[in-house]
């Protein structure tokens, strides 16, 4: 099973009765990409959401699919849902940020990324946490996440709590981080983007 | 912090019913799943079954079709199990467990934080 | 059902020893095995979920490894606050089933 199915079918069962059926209804005039035919009326409507999951993979493969029912979930209304849904699906096999929707995931990028390079340093010298949290936070960050970390009594403490989360993150939630830090102290990314 | 505080301990006939009661509080109840084990005494863990919270989807184990019914109250942010027609293999202590979806974590529906425990006797 | 294998069923071991217990299970569960602490009376504590990550508030000493059917938790050097039933659990397909615990004590 892959992640995006489970991701799909874990909003779907998250859908009451009603909703599902919206749902549904919503799916056979959603828009499709080129190429991409639709489920059937007859079928569609009978589906429980274990159902309705496999067929959505069959019928649109794992990451279209997981798109198309962000999509349909957005256009309910369901914009937490939906977005949590998206940034999964961009996640393979890492964690899915809290909350908003992370950009789409940019191609693999070989090595470690700047602030797995940089944890020591990052942790000893980031003095502004609070606006990386802030900047984080409903992004990458669970409310209990932000909690955790403002919680710690100094600085070096809530970075280290900070970065006790980033095992989980893909690229583009690190990258959120990066820009975050650039925003707030960009004297001290380019000092280490030089060192 | 993240608690799940569950109800008193219950003593009951046989064939009789009993509702226990898991209640959440330190997070958003509907995001996050429910499950529920039972361990009698001196034995291992078993899984009974889950509940989505938001939309009181359950799935059970087939060991517990018919014993458990599980349901989930979102207003006052707690779960309920119902176990029925109860014997004496129903004696043990029930905990519910929080589990993290699989659009919200890298590792969906492993349990995160437990509950109490209830403490189901049952006798004549 | 997926069937979890745990061994050892009961051991004994000294104060800063190394003690690894192991979980089978009998298909590929895919990471998705997780591991709990249960002391007497008490409830599980969550100690390590996706096979290798650390559950928050658990000390560095427990590592948990393995991948496909094979997995194991470790403690680098026991502590007599230790001394507990250690479960193992896969989540990856209903129905989740765990192994039948290691009761771990103190020489």
């Known amino acids: 099973m892959g992640r995006a199915r489970d991701a799909i079918l874990d909003a779907l069962e998250n859908l009451t009765a009603e909703e599902l059926k919206k749902f549904k209804l919503k799916l056979l005039s959603v828009p499709l990409r080129e190429g991409y035919g639709r489920i059937p009326r007859g079928a569609l409507l009978s589906m429980d959401a274990l159902d309705l999951t496999d067929k959505l993979v069959s019928f649109y493969l794992e990451t279209y699919g997981a798109e198309l029912t962000a999509n349909v979930l957005r256009d309910m209304g369901l914009q937490e849902m939906a977005g949590q849904l998206q940034a999964a699906t961009h996640q393979g096999s890492g964690a899915a940020p809290a909350g908003i929707q992370a950009p789409p995931q940019s191609a693999a990028k070989p090595g470690l990324h700047f602030i797995d390079q940089h944890r020591a340093a990052l942790i000893a010298r980031v003095t502004n946490v609070e606006w990386l949290l802030d900047a984080l936070y409903g992004k990458v960050l669970t409310d209990e996440q932000y909690q955790a970390v403002r919680a710690e009594p100094t600085n070096p403490s809530k970075m280290r709590k900070l970065f006790s989360f980033t095992p989980a993150w893909n690229w583009t939630c690190k990258d959120l981080l990066l820009q975050a830090l650039r925003e707030s102290q960009s004297y001290l990314v380019e000092d280490l983007e030089r060192s | 912090q993240v608690q799940l505080q569950q109800s008193g301990a219950e003593l009951a006939r046989p064939g009789a019913s009993v509702k226990l009661s898991c209640k959440a509080s330190?997070?958003?109840?509907?995001?996050?799943?429910i499950n529920w084990v039972k361990q009698r005494t001196g034995q291992g863990l078993e899984w009974i079954g889950k509940?989505?919270?938001?939309?009181?989807?359950?799935h059970n184990n087939e060991n517990f079709k018919g014993k458990a019914t599980l349901t989930a109250d979102t207003s006052s942010s707690t779960a309920y199990m119902d176990l029925r027609s109860l014997t004496s293999e129903d004696s043990a202590v029930y905990f519910c467990?929080?589990?993290?979806?699989?659009?919200?974590?890298?590792?969906?529906?492993?349990?995160?934080?437990w509950g109490t425990g209830t403490t189901v006797t049952v006798s004549s | 059902d997926i069937k979890m294998t745990q061994s050892p069923s009961s051991m004994y071991a000294s104060l800063g020893e190394r003690v690894t217990i192991t979980c089978k299970a009998s298909?590929?569960?895919?990471?998705?095995l997780s591991w709990y602490q249960q002391k007497p009376w008490k409830s599980p504590k969550t100690l390590i979920y996706?096979?290798?990550s650390l559950a928050d508030g658990v000390p560095s000493r427990f590592s948990g490894s393995g991948s496909g059917q094979d997995y194991s938790l470790t403690i680098s050097s026991l502590e007599s606050d230790d001394t507990a039933t250690y479960y193992c659990?896969?989540?990856?397909?209903?129905?989740?089933?765990f192994g039948s615990g290691t009761k771990l004590e103190i020489k």
């Open positions: 509940i989505y919270p938001r939309s009181g989807n359950t």
């Open positions: 298909q590929d569960i895919k990471s998705y």
């Open positions: 996706y096979a290798t």
């Open positions: 659990l896969q989540h990856g397909e209903s129905p989740f089933t």
């Open positions: 330190g997070y958003n109840f509907t995001t996050y799943g």
């Open positions: 467990a929080r589990s993290p979806y699989a659009f919200y974590s890298s590792s969906y529906w492993y349990f995160d934080v």
